[in-house]
Interface confidence: low
Amino acid sequence: DNKGYCAQYRGEVCNAVLAKDALVFLNTSYADPEEAQELLVHTAWNELKVVSPVCRPAAEALLCNHIFQECSPGVVPTPIPICREYCLAVKELFCAKEWLVMEEKTHRGLYRSEMHLLSVPECSKLPSMHWDPTACARL
């Protein structure tokens, strides 16, 4: 459900990844969107500590830009999803091994909560930058 509002990012986890005055989409399906989305990032971020140095920065960028999507202040505030190409680059290039492990763990039900599922975008469902360059965010 894409009901929410635009606000400046005031969290800590994604400070180094998001632009200084980034306008992000806060989803009002959560009672406290800022806190809930920050917790999502924080939980997933901790799991990234064990991934390779090549994967980590790319995964952090993907994670922060997926959970705190860029917000377009329109007639109704709208989240701008990550471009499919950037998601696939992280999945197939920078983090191929880690992504496979994660998908296997998910398939076998080895995660304690569903929270990490919300942290990982499905690349195939994201818009391509070749369809409309303004319809998605570039990492």
């Epitope: 009901k3 929410g4 509002y5 635009c6 606000a7 400046q8 306008l23 009002t28 917000c71 202040p73 329109g74 007639v75 109704v76 505030p77």
Partner: antibody, heavy 118, light 108 residues
Amino acid sequence: QVQLVQSGAEVKKPGASVKVSCKASGYTFTGYYMHWVRQAPGQGLEWMGWINPHSGGTNYAQKFQGRVTMTRDTSISTAYMELSRLRSDDTAVYSCASGLGISAFDIWGQGTMVTVSS
Amino acid sequence: SYVLTQPPSVSVAPGQTARITCGGNNIGSKSVHWYQQKPGQAPVLVVYDDSDRPSGIPERFSGSNSGNTATLTISRVEAGDEADYYCQVWDSSSDHYVFGTGTKVTVL
């Protein structure tokens, strides 16, 4: 609390310009379009246009194209509406308004009376 | 450009129901908003997206929209409901907003 505070009443001569300000507080100013609406004495509401405070992009009603300019200063969370080549029928109350997460206008400024008279 | 037509006035006795219509070509395909404006005051949003009510607006205010007509219904009308009422739509093709002509509601 969330509010929009506008500048005070103005009296202008025909042919002059007027610039009305609208200061936002209590919410993220750059997160929502700011609209300008006017109402002539005894008349209905008339939408003039919007500004995207984040990008500075604007969209004006056909009627005001070429005469209206909407700007903003994000450092002080303030939107401006300037109307040039004023005529007597521009005498009206000018209001800023915004919709916080909905496409309707749920917050309004108190209005600024602009009188155009020779 | 898109035109919204409202009756100039509606009169209603206290405790009765007032219905204000807003006519527009295929208005049912658009989201309609309704505003109440009392003399010398800024408009107040009473119904948005056809039938949703902002917090603080009594349940007596309701809206519907289909075909070429949107309707604002005020049930159990009170003296304090006397005001001008305006419908509004966003015309997505032009990215412009349009207000209706306005209806003066008089409580007898």
